[in-house]
Amino acid sequence: KFSKQSWGLENEALIVRCPRQGKSSYIVDWYYSQTNKSIPTQERNRVFASGQLLKFLPAEVADSGIYTCIVRSPTFNRTGYANVTIYKKQPDCNVPDYLMYSTVSGSEKNSKIYCPTIDLYNWTAPLEWFKNCQALQGSRYKAHKSFLVIDNVMTDDAGDYTCKFIHNENGANYSVTATRSFTVKDEQGFSRFPVIRAPAHNETKEVEIGENTNLTCSACFGKGAQFLATVQWQLNGNKITDFSEPRIQQEEGQNQSFSNGLACVNTVLRIADVKEEDLLLRYDCLALNLHGLRRHTIRLSRKN
């Protein structure tokens, strides 16, 4: 339940955070899960625990395995697991899928590529950036704090970007690299402030208790491919995913393009077996893009 995957390369630093929430004053104990052997806190060890963090300085392939962290909070101990895999360095330039962090998308107007996991490390600027193993050079590339900005993004800027930085621990330096894919969204057309086509703002929908009902949130964002265009439902101002009611489900947004070229998205909220308590909820249709957020509210009322 409270398990997190982490990975790194041999001879590089790897720092892993306990997946359980902690507070600065609470001790965190780390163990090798298989042996239940405690991980030392002394910094002279290659692998040592430092509060919420487990540090491999540097990592070895043999370090791979599951590590248990226990947050010694008062009242209850909170247990988490870090599933660590250390890989051998690749002889060629190819970065295998299992070493890749989440893909990010960019466009002409927005081309930030964040260096994954960097906030766990004690690093100093500047970061080094590589694309398909080639060091990035030229005025189009700007390494800014923990991210890379590319000016005038073009489709051939897509690829695998690796950030490289130095982690410093007590005067010793360790190299860290992290790679993620960058995709470029085509931006022919335009983007504008979202327009919600349905529902009308402050609409009321009549429903029958015990029946199923669907609410459609439909919004348009401009013409052509959109960098960011999301349509979602919220209940009482909270995400559907935070709302543990299996009767109420949100479908994946369905993209639509009309004959006039408008880029629109529909998201359907399905409510099974409508209950009295559902009439008390506020249903918000949210449409969001880079220009901002528009919200239309709909409520349910009982059919007479």
Epitope: K1, Y26, P74, T75, F76
Partner: antibody, heavy 123, light 111 residues
Framework: EVQLVESGGGLVQPGGSLRLSCAAS????????MHWVRQVPGKGLEWISS???????YYPGSVKGRFTISRENARNSLYLQMNSLRAGDTAVYYC?????????????????WGQGTTVTVSS | NIVMTQTPLSLSVTPGQPASISCKSS???????????LFWYLQKPGQPPQLLIY???NRFSGVPDRFSGSGSGTDFTLKISRVEAEDVGVYSC????????FGPGTKVDIK
């Protein structure tokens, strides 16, 4: 105003089930651990279950396997599903607020309590 | 399990006079974070418990300064410097170092 309001108590036969609810308002519910404490009439207070901000649950042996605590952050609600009820479960059940995990220094124990809901197990 | 005991179990006090309640735990309530997880509650008739003292000696907001807590490790005391009529009820100590356990309560009434 910070408030907890319990509901769902009542009379139930031994072996029966009951679901208690607690509606929270006036604070960021999702950042607090939440708890149920009961009090047998004329007796002391007894802790019976807890749920932390990440959804982990805790019970004493007396109710483990029979009671299930859950929370619905979107509804600012805490629940206690009580099965296989016994006469010894007859008590006033209080919903109470615990540690705030959004505040590094915050720990006031069980600082906010509801008015309680009465559960009577009797044939 | 940590066991909490209280003495006395009942107390009759003259208004304006001091009162003292003792609470003992079966093991130290000092946590590795340096705090001691001992609390005092007052339950007035027909009401839920209300927090008086947290962390042994800190008065909760709105609690009159006639209430004070002291102690360390396993021995703790709640003192009321001058008892008032509104102070009647059952006073309980609670530990939250390991799960939660309450003392049996001390019933305070006015002579």
């Amino acid at each position: 105003e910070v408030q907890l309001v319990e509901s769902g108590g009542g009379l139930v036969q031994p072996g029966g089930s009951l679901r208690l609810s607690c509606a929270a308002s006036g604070f960021t519910f999702s950042t607090f651990d939440m708890h149920w404490v009961r009090q047998v009439p004329g007796k002391g207070l007894e802790w019976i279950s807890s749920i932390d901000t990440e959804g982990d649950t805790y019970y004493p042996g007396s109710v483990k396997g029979r009671f299930t605590i859950s929370r619905e952050n979107a509804r600012n609600s805490l629940y206690l599903q009580m099965n296989s009820l016994r006469a010894g479960d007859t008590a006033v059940y209080y919903c109470t607020r615990g540690e705030d995990w959004s505040d590094d220094d915050y720990y006031y124990g069980l600082d906010v309590w509801g008015q309680g809901t009465t559960v009577t197990v009797s044939s | 399990n940590i066991v909490m005991t209280q003495t006395p179990l009942s107390l009759s006090v003259t208004p304006g006079q001091p009162a003292s309640i003792s609470c003992k735990s079966s093991q130290s309530l000092l946590h590795s974070d340096g705090k001691t997880y001992l609390f005092w509650y007052l339950q007035k008739p027909g009401q839920p418990p209300q927090l008086l003292i947290y962390g042994v000696s800190n008065r909760f907001s709105g609690v009159p300064d006639r209430f004070s807590g002291s102690g360390s490790g396993t021995d703790f005391t709640l003192k009321i410097s001058r008892v008032e009529a509104e102070d009647v009820g059952v006073y309980s100590c609670m530990q939250s170092l390991q799960l939660f356990t309450f003392g049996p309560g001390t019933k305070v009434d006015i002579k």
